[in-house]
Structures are given as C-alpha cells and as structure tokens.
Interface confidence: low
C-alpha cells in the first residue's frame, strides 16, 4: 500500500543528546501516537523501519546498521547509538507498516557537545526543591534501560565544576542526591555521571538538572493584600484621574495559579461601560513567592464613579480573599466670598 | 464527488457540551487522516485535533486538550469531535478536512457553526 | 510551535494585475506548505501542497514557490472570482499552523 499515515516533523520531543555518550531512542508512535505497543504490533506482523534526514539535507536515506562495533542499532522499538558522533545530528523517521497498513513519525535528534563543566546548548529540567524543608532528593534522570540490573556502574555527582564531597548539607548517595535542609545557596546546575562497561568498553553517561529552591509549603499562607488598605483613602474631585494599586503577595506552592482581579459595583470591568483600564506587574522572590500588582485606573473620574464599590481580590490554592478600596469624593474647599461669608454673618 | 458534511453546531451554554459529525461520501474514510479546524468570528484558521486513518492515533491542540475528543467510525464513513466544558472561545465555524501528509488539507467541509454564549 | 506570517494584511490590486503574497514561517518547513483560499461564507480550498504544486483543478495563473522559511503565492493576472483571503499553512511540524492571512481585494 502506497498510503502512509503520516505524524509529520514530532518538534514536541526535542531530542538533545550528549556528543561520544551511549543514547537510547524509543520510537514516537507507540508512546504518543498509537494506541498499541511495539510488541502488540510486532505480534501482528507489523515491522519497524527506521529512516534519517542529515541536518541541513532534505533526502531521506537508510540508518547504517552495519557499522564497526555495532555503533547504531536497532533493538525492539529502540533506536541505539553506542556512541553518539556530532554528525549523527538530523530528523529520524521510524515506520511501522506491513502491507496493509503504514505509520510514521519524525522527530529531530541533536547531538551537543559539552565543556569541561558540563556547560552545554542542552534544555535542562529544573526541579524544585522545598526550602528548609528537610530530605529531599533529586535523582540522576534518564539512565534506565542502558545497563542490566546486574551491572554496577559508578556514579559522580558535581555541582557547576566542583565534585560533590564534604559538602555540608549535600550527600551523594548512588544515583541519588539527597539535600538535608535545601537552602538558597544550593541553587545551581548538578551533574551526575554515570560510568558503566559493556562488551569491554567503558561508556559514560552525562545527566544535569537544575536545582531551584523555592517556599515551603509549611511557610504557605493565604493570598495578603497590601494595598487597597484601611489607612489609604483615594480622594478624588470629578474629572481627576483614579489611581488605585491592588497589591496582593502570594506564597509560593507547586502548581498553584496566582489570580488576582478587580470588581466595581460587583462586577468584573469588562462588564461594565465606564472606561477603566488595568494594568499588572509581577515580581519574585527569590524563593518565587511572587508579588502581583494591577493598578486600576480611569482617567477622568465623574462623581458617579466615585460612588461605586472598589473591591481587589486575589486567590491561589491556599484560599481567597478580597479588599475594598475607600474612595470617596473630595469635598471641594469653601469659597470665602460666599460660603464663608455667610458663615460670619454677613448678608 | 468527494464531500464532507458537517453536522451538531449550535448554541450552547459554557461548561457544556456538543459532539459535531461529518459525513464522508466520494471516498472512503478509513483510507485517510482526517481533522478539525476552526474558525471564530472574522478572524484566522486554528488547527483543532487529528486523527489518523484507523483511529489509533489522536493529536489535540493545546487549547482544546482534554476537553475535546476526535474519534471516527469507518463503517459509517464519519468523523466526530466530542466537545465538553465548553468556553466562549471556542465559538467558531468548526470544518472536517481530509488529511494526507504531501497534500495537506486538500478536501473540506462547508463548517458547522458552534456558538458558546450564556 | 511555528508561527506562520503572512504579508500583506490586505492587498488591493485591479483585475488582471499581478498579485504577490508572502508567507514566512519562523523555522523551516521544508516545503510542506499549503496555500487555501477563502471567499466569505465558504470554506477553504486548496490551491498549493508542497510549496508548489497546484491542487486538482486549479487554474495555471496560481503559482507557489519558495521554500525553507519563505514562500510565495503569485497571482498571475487577477480574475474577478481571484478576490478572497489566502492563507498558508505548514504541516512540517506538529502542530499545524496558519497563517492569520492575506485579503485580496478590488483596487
């Protein structure tokens, strides 16, 4: 059959890995595109063909099985280079057809070198750690699969350039790297290199996240506003501009979303026909609690407008909350030749 | 004469629900990738979801992703898209297409109108 | 995801004129780019695949070219049923994208 149900260019999966270091590539289609498994399929009678394009070609052409050492290979519905080679860079098809039926997908692969620190064009993961939180522990990502249980590979953990040991708060335990009480100063980029043999040869595998330490769930608290508060009045004469910032602080917590906005008589500003605009700004600590302003403004204010309710509210996972602002019209100062005139008797 | 024809538009209220239908006829179905797209009021085509010929492999757009459901039934030579919690940007002319690789969407529906409105 | 611009907004041209519309997408397609048109009310048709192939049924005076990041649909000499909105579209990368489109219009 001529027909191919094609997936296209998969940018999704943005492939990066490290230049003279063992990489294990699972064909797209079985984990994002078809219902079924490779084995299911392989049961089936349906075989996996993989193809490539070099970087900066548009011709398509066979994966050379038959290189020294077995250096690509094909094993079940994974690719496998043992090692990388900067010019192994480009798109990779894999097809799953018979003659019945056809699936494919393409997804770029970048090969990257890297420096002596482990600097790199590699997108690292960042995870986030709780701070003075107690254990936590992030684990060496993506190793799985490259070496059977029976082997014991060696593992060496850095932070930035520097091997981790006596460290104070910082153990290297395996494949895992545990922080007894995160604090800010662990922020930073580490690395784990895991050395393991295979057939006689030595392979090494080069993995680095990004630690971020961030507020503690414990230290969490509702949404605060700042402003509007009880000591601010916004006086206004008709026809000035109305100013009034809603300030709110949020605590940082995983996943929350951050709102905050403004209603007048009860109703959100879109809602309502006076000329009102908003504008916001947000800021972060360092542990990304996070500072959110939206400044409501309306540039010539009538007397009406100075009636309405005013009100900020704000809400995250820990909860909602709300603050009237006090607005209120300015009295306008006496005029002597009348007002206070009168007020000393004169007729 | 290859056609599709959409069906299932209308006035609903947001958070609730829709499943539109195109019917194929000129071709069969299960030979082709078929997909949604949409187009609000007055502006630009957005690509909605993809399904590949028999089914097996579904894409969403993000904006859509675990609210709308693509599904087909070759036997009947339809295409669905099962609609929930809807929102008001999701008003639109909602159109089937048929998809190949090398030809893009080289046959579509005349669109069905979806409008999400209180 | 690839952004697809397409220029002008709006093109005025008299019939029988040459119409040029651009297209550029903000990392290579390849040449798996299609160009649609669209009159008021209809749906799309497509006019170009593959950056230059015309679809089944389309007149010669429709041509397609470019590829990489920039592409163009030319109009050789403008017919009445010509005024519409073109758009292109990429289907490299998933997911698809269009362009937000070009109006053809009477001068």
């Known amino acids: 059959s001529e027909r191919c149900d094609d997936w296209g260019l998969d940018t999704m999966r943005q492939i990066q890995v490290f230049e003279d270091e063992p990489a294990r590539i699972k064909c797209p289609l079985f984990e994002h595109f078809l219902k079924f498994n490779y084995s299911t399929a392989h049961s089936a009678g349906l075989t996996l063909i993989w193809y490539w394009t070099r970087q900066d070609r548009d011709l398509e052409e066979p994966i050379n099985f038959r290189l020294p050492e077995n250096r690509i290979s094909k094993e079940k519905d994974v690719l496998w280079f043992r090692p990388t080679l900067l010019n192994d860079t480009g798109n990779y098809t894999c097809m799953l057809r018979n003659t019945t039926y056809c699936s494919k997908v393409a997804f770029p692969l970048e090969v990257v070198q890297k420096d002596s620190c482990f600097n790199s064009p590699m997108k690292l993961p960042v995870h986030k750690l709780y701070i003075e939180y107690g254990i936590q522990r992030i684990t060496c990502p993506n190793v799985d699969g490259y070496f059977p249980s029976s082997v014991k590979p060696t593992i060496t953990w850095y932070m930035g350039c520097y091997k981790i040991q006596n460290f104070n708060n910082v153990i290297p335990e395996g494949m895992n790297l545990s922080f007894l009480i995160a604090l800010i100063s662990n922020n930073g980029n580490y690395t784990c290199v895991v050395t393991y043999p295979e057939n006689g040869r030595t392979f090494h595998l080069t993995r680095t996240l990004t630690v971020k330490v961030v507020g503690s769930p414990k230290n969490a608290v509702p949404p605060v506003i700042h402003s509007p508060n009880d000591h601010v009045v916004y006086e206004k004469e008709p026809g000035e501009e109305l100013l009034i910032p809603c300030t709110v602080y949020f605590s940082f917590l995983m996943d929350s979303r951050n709102e905050v906005w403004w209603t007048i008589d009860g109703k959100k500003p879109d809602d309502i026909t006076i000329d009102v605009t908003i504008n916001e700004s947000i800021s972060h600590s360092r542990t990304e609690d996070e500072t959110r302003t939206q400044i409501l403004s309306i540039k010539k204010v009538t007397s009406e407008d100075l009636k309405r309710s005013y009100v900020c509210h704000a809400r995250s996972a820990k909860g909602e909350v709300a603050k009237a602002a006090k607005v209120k019209q300015k009295v306008p100062a006496p005029r002597y030749t009348v007002e206070l005139a009168c007020g000393f008797g004169a007729t | 004469e290859v056609q599709l024809l959409e069906s299932g538009g209308g006035l609903v209220q947001p958070g609730g629900s829709l499943r539109l239908s195109c019917a194929a006829s000129?071709?069969?179905?299960?030979?082709?990738?078929m997909s949604w797209v949409r187009q609000a009021p007055g502006k630009g085509l957005e690509w909605v979801s993809a399904i590949s010929y028999d089914g097996e492999g579904t894409l969403y757009a993000d904006s859509v992703k675990g609210r709308f459901t693509i599904s087909r039934d070759n036997s009947k030579n339809t295409l669905y898209l099962q609609m929930n919690s809807l929102r008001a940007e999701d008003t639109a002319v909602y159109y089937c297409?048929?998809?190949?690789?090398?030809?893009?969407?080289?046959?579509w529906g005349q669109g069905t109108l979806v409008t999400v409105s209180s | 995801e690839i952004v697809m611009t397409q220029s002008p907004a709006t093109l005025s041209v008299s019939p029988g004129e040459r119409a040029t519309l651009s297209c550029r997408a903000s990392?290579?397609?390849?040449?798996?780019l299609a160009w649609y048109q669209q009159k008021p009310g209809q749906a799309p048709r497509l006019l170009i695949y593959g950056a230059s192939t015309r679809a089944t049924g389309i007149p010669a005076r429709f041509s397609g070219s470019g590829s990489g990041t920039e592409f163009t649909l030319t109009i050789s000499s403008l017919q009445s049923e010509d005024f519409a909105v073109y758009y292109c579209q990429q289907y490299n990368n998933w997911p698809w994208t269009f362009g937000q489109g070009t109006k053809v219009e009477i001068k």
């Open positions: 297409a048929r998809f190949r690789y090398y030809t893009a969407f080289d046959y």
């Open positions: 000129g071709f069969t179905l299960s030979g082709f990738s």
């Open positions: 990392q290579s397609v390849s040449s798996n």
